[in-house]
């Protein structure tokens, strides 16, 4: 809500998971390993990489069944924290100048930071409109007090808030699971909100930081190949 | 509360066109995804699609060739146009309200309806 | 698509007895469940959503359980103003109705 069409291809680690429709995003972070959004969970995806208009083939497309989706053990539909998941490409992507990895934070997101959010995801605050082109917002990360504020009781230290606390611009339906970019590493998920694009409403993301172990752990031992030292 | 009509003709052609209208009354037709269900006499129930009012639309796959939905929000309603039926297309038609206007999550996903209309009977027939 | 397989098509019980109806997916559709009522001649009815969750206004002696793909509807004690067919539907990916449970009164 509230963005522009994104470059073509300029955001070359953003993916459409699709189950027969887009239903959630996701960030390439290797050649075989999608993160999402742990609600974005279903035990059949179809990773689209590469993609600008979901709805016309371009030429730059990867289309690669998921091998394995594995929701983070501590996931709470309820609450929503640990809203995270991880998808392993049942063959690696093709890396080149339209897909491509994004790095995993090396440190926690700090307060004013501008970030990237994109997403094929609805529009409209009041109503739905889904756009087939990519969507970029550029925002801000709001403080954990903002934040806290915003939703009282409802935000874990696993939470950040990104967007306006006078509303207008946000991530909404259909961009859960994609990424929130700063200075080139993903540092938040698309997760939720009350709403899309509310004053004193922002945009509730995962905290990639907190997850960069279990990210890693979880792909070594989903890998063919252990290395035992 | 909000309540649901729907209205078309009760009788139907083999091969023409089925359409059909749902008026939304008691609240506004903005805020939610709207359906259509049919239920043929005596069996069970098949989802036919959802609609935005944006006019974004989800159809079920076995009858997306045949099915259109659109929407009008000054009138508050929505509509069906099933093509090329059949007998088979006999059936209770029933246009409901999905059961959340869009959720806290940010995925897509289908929710079901917690309000519906009477239904009205289309019979296919020459 | 999904398909959803519902048991048994039809029950009989006496006033007070406990129901199960069973409902069982295709595939993994997580919590993704709803279960509806229906009487004769009327509109489906919601009475749980995602698999547990009990509709607003809707008597607490109905009840849902499940994930994946086993999910169980029950009513703890039934009343004769139950008497209905009910209907188990997957929201997990479009939209799919099981065939369908009708209760009766022995």
């Known amino acids: 809500v509230g963005g522009y069409i994104c470059e073509e291809n300029s955001v070359p680690y953003q993916v459409s998971l699709n189950s027969g429709y887009h239903f959630c995003g996701g960030s390439l972070i290797s050649e075989q390993w999608v993160v999402s959004a742990g609600h974005c969970y279903k035990s059949r995806i179809q990773v689209r990489l590469g993609e600008h208009n979901i709805e016309v083939l371009e030429g730059n497309e990867q289309f690669i069944n998921a091998a394995k989706i594995i929701r983070h053990p501590k996931y709470n539909s309820r609450t929503l924290d640990n809203d995270i998941l991880l998808i392993k490409l049942s063959s690696p992507a093709v890396i080149n100048s339209r897909v491509s990895a994004i790095s995993l934070p090396t440190a926690p997101p700090a307060a004013g930071t501008e970030s990237l959010i994109s997403g094929w995801g609805n529009t409209l605050s009041s109503g739905a409109d889904y756009p087939d082109e990519l969507q970029c917002l550029d925002a801000p990360v709001l403080s954990q007090a903002e934040c806290e504020a915003s939703y009282p009781g409802k935000i874990t230290n696993n939470m950040f808030c990104v967007g306006f606390l006078e509303g207008g611009k946000d991530s909404c339906q259909g961009d859960a699971g994609g990424p929130v970019v700063s200075n080139g590493e993903l540092q938040g998920i698309v997760s939720w909100g009350y709403g899309c694009a509310q004053k004193n409403r922002p945009g509730v993301y995962t905290k990639v930081y907190n997850y960069v172990d279990w990210i890693k752990d979880t792909i070594a031992a989903n890998s063919h190949h252990h290395h035992h030292h | 509360q909000v309540q649901l009509q729907e209205s078309g003709p009760g009788l139907v052609k083999p091969s023409e066109t089925l359409s059909l209208t749902c008026t939304v009354s008691g609240g506004s037709i903005s805020s939610h995804y709207w359906h259509w269900i049919r239920q043929p006499a005596g069996k069970g129930l098949e989802w036919i699609g959802r609609i935005a009012t944006s006019g974004s639309t989800y159809y079920n796959p076995s009858l997306k060739s045949r099915v259109t939905m659109s929407v009008d929000t000054s009138k508050n309603q929505f509509s069906l146009k099933l093509s090329s039926v059949t007998a088979a297309d006999t059936a209770v038609y029933y246009c409901?309200?999905?059961?959340?206007?869009?959720?806290?999550?940010?995925?897509?996903?289908?929710?079901?309806?917690?309000?519906w209309g009477q239904g009205t009977t289309v019979t296919v027939s020459s | 698509d999904i398909q959803m397989t519902q048991s048994p098509s039809s029950l009989s019980a006496s006033v007070g007895d406990r129901v199960t109806i069973t409902c069982q997916a295709s595939?993994?559709?997580?919590?993704?469940l709803n279960w509806y009522q229906q009487k004769p001649g009327k509109a489906p009815k919601l009475l749980i959503y995602d698999a547990s969750n009990l509709e607003t206004g809707v008597p607490s002696r109905f009840s849902g359980s499940g994930s994946g793909t086993d999910f169980t509807f029950t009513i703890s004690s039934l009343q004769p103003e139950d008497i209905a067919t009910y209907y188990c539907?997957?929201?997990?990916?479009?939209?799919?109705f099981g065939g369908g449970t009708k209760v009766e009164i022995k």
């Open positions: 595939q993994d559709i997580s919590n993704y």
């Open positions: 539907q997957q929201v997990d990916n479009f939209i799919t």
């Open positions: 409901a309200r999905d059961l959340t206007n869009y959720g806290i999550t940010k995925s897509i996903r289908f929710y079901g309806m917690d309000v």
